[in-house]
Amino acid sequence: IWELKKDVYVVELDWYPDAPGEMVVLTCDTPEEDGITWTLDQSSEVLGSGKTLTIQVKEFGDAGQYTCHKGGEVLSHSLLLLHKKEDGIWSTDILKDQKEPKNKTFLRCEAKNYSGRFTCWWLTTISTDLTFSVKSSRGSSDPQGVTCGAATLSAERVRGDNKEYEYSVECQEDSACPAAEESLPIEVMVDAVHKLKYENYTSSFFIRDIIKPDPPKNLQLKPLKNSRQVEVSWEYPDTWSTPHSYFSLTFCVQVQGKSKREKKDRVFADKTSATVICRKNASISVRAQDRYYSSSWSEWASVPCSGSGSSRGGSGSGGSGGGGSKLRAVPGGSSPAWTQCQQLSQKLCTLAWSAHPLVGHMDLREEGDEETTNDVPHIQCGDGCDPQGLRDNSQFCLQRIHQGLIFYEKLLGSDIFTGEPSLLPDSPVGQLHASLLGLSQLLQPEGHHWETQQIPSLSPSQPWQRLLLRFKILRSLQAFVAVAARVFAHGAATLSP
């Protein structure tokens, strides 16, 4: 038994036929010693007398609000809730399995940007006697603060004969660092109480993995003269992180009729315009995704081909360029070839994702991820890799990136990747390895040697452990190269001569 909040206790029960249950001792919160009686819920039947009451809790009939009285006056209450465990698994009766992106997904979370603000939601078919409370932190062993609001009913839907209720909560990391590479996941814990049943649900994620931008705004069509082509332009959504030269999006532009089976024109764009072929009765749709990290695509923003006006949705100007002052030449150090570094780091991003595209197929955090990812270098908040830090002095950040590149290059050449089980011959790890080396050489100033980080002894003994370690290393490499690519893109846009 444990205390959920003041005067509310959770009794954990192994749930099987003829289970002995749990013996619980309740103590009346009063200085009085005698003349105390106990009742359960609205019943006037006296269950016992004395300052303490010992009960055997076996089923929901034994749970509820126990009240101690003296002479017709209520002294204190203790609410007992049950948390069922069947075959070693805690019950999950209150929330609905959303089955996306995998089975046993009860909580789903999304973030519109890297500000540390995110929304989680869950589904239930229960309409009454239901309460939720949400807690969150960054990391679990030495948790950093995340503040969550109250969970609220956000939608009601009819699904067949049943009504489905969606609840959501907004949370904000207290000291968010948008430009840093996350090393510890956000933990979200939801306590759910339905009548006398208690359940808890948890989710663990990095903000980068739950990013889903808002749709692009201000879609505009401009027919081109003497052509079937139309120039479509749009803007970054207002909610996306700034500056856009650092937090860049990529876009997919599609022209399609009402049916998904119809033929289509599709083009990808890094700029905020593209030229497409419009057809009668078709629509032009644009969606956005983080340019350097393969998180979710936004929903589509659409405009009909027939009208050449602007789309429904946001208006306003919202800049798309880097803006701001130029980066200063680096004191006491030479400036890198920003554009070359940008191209190579973007290539690294695509290679890192083709080497390990299985996002979410293997939940690595269940395998003690905090320890492993602490062994690899991360671009942290104080490393000067944010836009302001780059403007002040890019050397700190470039040195950190260089250290990381060397570290990962050595890891990819180590027996973690060369040992059994052998990599598939079509694995892009070889190209990734060569590109890491190429970028690190571009960064290393002539006659200047930055200190490199020692590689920890991560070498596992079992092939299956090696396989797991490869996945973890590639996942953290994806995050590392995304930050590096942002740095070089911003540098190329605001520093390159």
Epitope: R228, T250, E262, K263, K264, D265, F268, T275, I277, T350
Partner: antibody, heavy 118, light 107 residues
């Protein structure tokens, strides 16, 4: 399955015209865009243009504008490419291809060799 | 128009070895790039679309990467049936244009 069968080889004199046909089967003809791509002997591939059989919309490469006409006959699921004012450097294999996506080429015909010689 | 440049023009590789083919665009084309294989006397065949998307029925040894102006087609372990000419094609803007091709021949 989706199939494109093209007409046979042609020999033409400079200044003449040629009309190559491409018969589609295995799908609803109006559901796919149709392109024409040519390849001169020992050379690379060159895109000529596309047609949407649903509405007859076309887009031609600037190089062929004014000299090429692409048409379709939905009743026979056949596409045609006519090239006029032929020159010797028009000697090539002409391919038709079809795809639900406008900008790349999924299903190819077997090709039609057109020789322009005096 | 966008000019596509493929290198090398000819690549001599032994069976079982890795082949890396490059394609460069004269301006940034995001991931609007597709790869084709053509064997003598045959029509080309689509291998990869949008830079890295694989086609069902195409062996997994063919993989594509890149974005912007630099693209790579990798054949991880060349089989005898892979000796052919490979073309890249951009679809960023009309006119659609192809690279000059890379001939992969037996060393």
């Amino acid at each position: 399955q989706v199939q494109l069968v093209q007409s046979g080889a042609e020999v033409k004199k400079p200044g003449a015209s040629v009309k190559v046909s491409c018969k589609a089967s295995g799908y609803t003809f109006t559901d796919y865009y149709l392109h024409w791509v040519r390849q001169a002997p020992g050379q690379g591939l060159e895109w000529m243009g596309w047609i949407d059989p649903e509405n007859g919309d076309t887009e031609y490469a600037p190089k062929f504008q004014g000299r090429v006409t692409m048409t379709t006959d939905t009743s026979t699921s056949t596409a045609y490419m006519e090239l006029r004012s032929l020159r010797s450097d028009d000697t090539a294999v002409y391919y038709c291809n079809a795809n639900k996506e406008l900008r790349y080429f999924d299903v190819w015909g077997q090709g039609t060799m057109v020789t322009v010689s005096s | 128009e966008i000019v596509m440049t493929q290198s090398p023009a000819t690549l001599s590789v032994s069976p079982g070895e890795r082949a890396t083919l490059s394609c460069r665009a004269s301006q940034s084309i995001s991931i609007n790039l597709h790869w084709y294989q053509q064997k003598p006397g045959q029509a080309p065949r689509l291998l990869i679309y949008f830079a890295s998307q694989s086609i069902s029925g195409i062996p997994a040894r063919f993989s594509g990467s890149g974005s912007g102006t630099e693209f790579t087609l990798t054949i991880s372990s060349l089989q005898s049936e892979d000796f052919a000419v490979y073309y890249c094609q951009q679809s960023n803007s009309f006119p659609l244009t192809f690279g000059g091709g890379t001939k992969v021949e037996i060393k």
